[in-house]
Interface confidence: low
Amino acid sequence: MADNFSLHDALSGSGNPNPQGWPGAWGNQPAGAGGYPGASYPGAYPGQAPPGAYPGQAPPGAYPGAPGAYPGAPAPGVYPGPPSGPGAYPSSGQPSATGAYPATGPYGAPAGPLIVPYNLPLPGGVVPRMLITILGTVKPNANRIALDFQRGNDVAFHFNPRFNENNRRVIVCNTKLDNNWGREERQSVFPFESGKPFKIQVLVEPDHFKVAVNDAHLLQYNHRVKKLNEISKLGISGDIDLTSASYTMI
């Protein structure tokens, strides 16, 4: 499910500047080793572990740069407003691309704390080259995070980091059709840590979702629900403080 793609490889300019064909706009390298621009700890937020997870939990406010600390994230207060019509994403003075989604954005939740569980409407469904960005901080003693790309009652893509499944940290991806879960795809690379900020980016491709966390590629998940335009809601839940959720076209 994962490959060895690293954003650094893609952006470093050595050899093929984009070996996996990922868009250049896919995230940015964090400043410093494992750090976040604007954050005071380079990759080391104090914290306490969820059972079986990363022992470490952050004090409230341990993410000094939030919500504008990530390059490419919406600046605080950036919220162009809801769509003005079905399937249309007006861009507040920015040119529209052909089709339902403009080439720029982002659109979605206002930057700032959001109530979890949170539903991000995707009124035109998802389309290839759509980039969904979720910023937040893992709560102290977290047990789970879940992203659910929903098509009605079906879950087209369930992305579920579990901090303690039989004393292991694992990310489980799956699809739910007609109330039945399918075959799980599991990923043991686990980039989330209790008490630390995160950036999840989901890039929609024609035949799969690509997921990057903290600017590093994590996994891809082949589409099992083919009607992408009917995947009209992203549910965000679990043990996180959610700073922002937005999408744009790249």
Partner: antibody, heavy 119, light 107 residues
């Protein structure tokens, strides 16, 4: 500065109960989980488990399930280890140790509490 | 459970020597390894976390390396205050487990 101060040595008889305290200072108590580690005389370190100081949820390793209980008095920034129905093999020094910023690392330790079980 | 095997179990060295202690994990623990120092009759102290990162206040003559299943702790220019037992500990999965310890003595 960060300090973990444990209660004093205990001498008990088999079948009795002991409760050891670990008072934390110098940091926000609920931000870091508290571990308990056993060291029998002349032996190495054995991790007993930890307690989530934010939720109070304890996690015990298999060897320390049943007679052992971790608890908290959050208002006093204190963690406790209680051992019920003491056995001779419980004779050891017990350390509390707080989790640090990175996976699994215990960055500050209490001075240890010696528990002697003898009839 | 992940078994941590330290070698040697004891080691004699002279002041000024460079010594190396190894720790082998029975399965991949990535970089989630810590090293502790315990002086006789004293408490364990964290030296190294995440395989190679020096804890606050630890002298720079201590260094750690490795990932996966093989790890080393190196002490360059051994000092009298370094005489202690050293333990490795994995933080990859429960239960966290310690190595059996390496007792460092002066020749």
């Amino acid at each position: 500065q960060i300090q973990l101060v444990q209660s004093g040595p205990e001498v008990k008889k088999p079948g009795e109960t002991v409760k050891i305290s670990c008072k934390a200072s110098g940091y926000i108590f609920t931000n870091y989980g508290m571990n308990w580690v056993k060291q029998a005389p002349g032996k190495g370190l054995k991790w007993m488990g930890w307690i989530n100081t934010y939720t109070g949820e304890p996690t015990y390793t298999d060897d320390f399930k049943g007679r052992f209980a971790f608890s908290l008095e959050t208002s006093a920034s204190t963690a406790y280890l209680q051992i019920n129905n003491l056995k001779n093999e419980d004779t050891a020094t017990y350390f509390c140790a707080k989790f640090g910023n990175y996976v699994g690392a215990m960055d500050y330790w209490g001075q240890g509490t010696s528990v002697t079980v003898s009839s | 459970d992940i078994r941590m095997t330290q070698s040697p179990s004891s080691l004699s060295a002279s002041l000024g020597d460079t010594i190396t202690i190894t720790c082998h994990a029975s399965q991949n623990i990535n970089v989630w390894l810590s090293w502790y120092q315990q002086k006789p009759g004293n408490i364990p102290k964290l030296l190294i976390y995440k395989a190679s990162n020096l804890h606050t206040g630890v002298p720079s003559r201590f260094s750690g390396s490795g990932s996966g299943t093989g790890f080393t702790l190196t002490i360059s220019s051994l000092q009298p205050e370094d005489i202690a037992t050293y333990y490795c500990q994995q933080g990859q999965s429960y239960p966290y487990t310690f190595g059996g310890g390496t007792k460092l003595e002066l020749k």
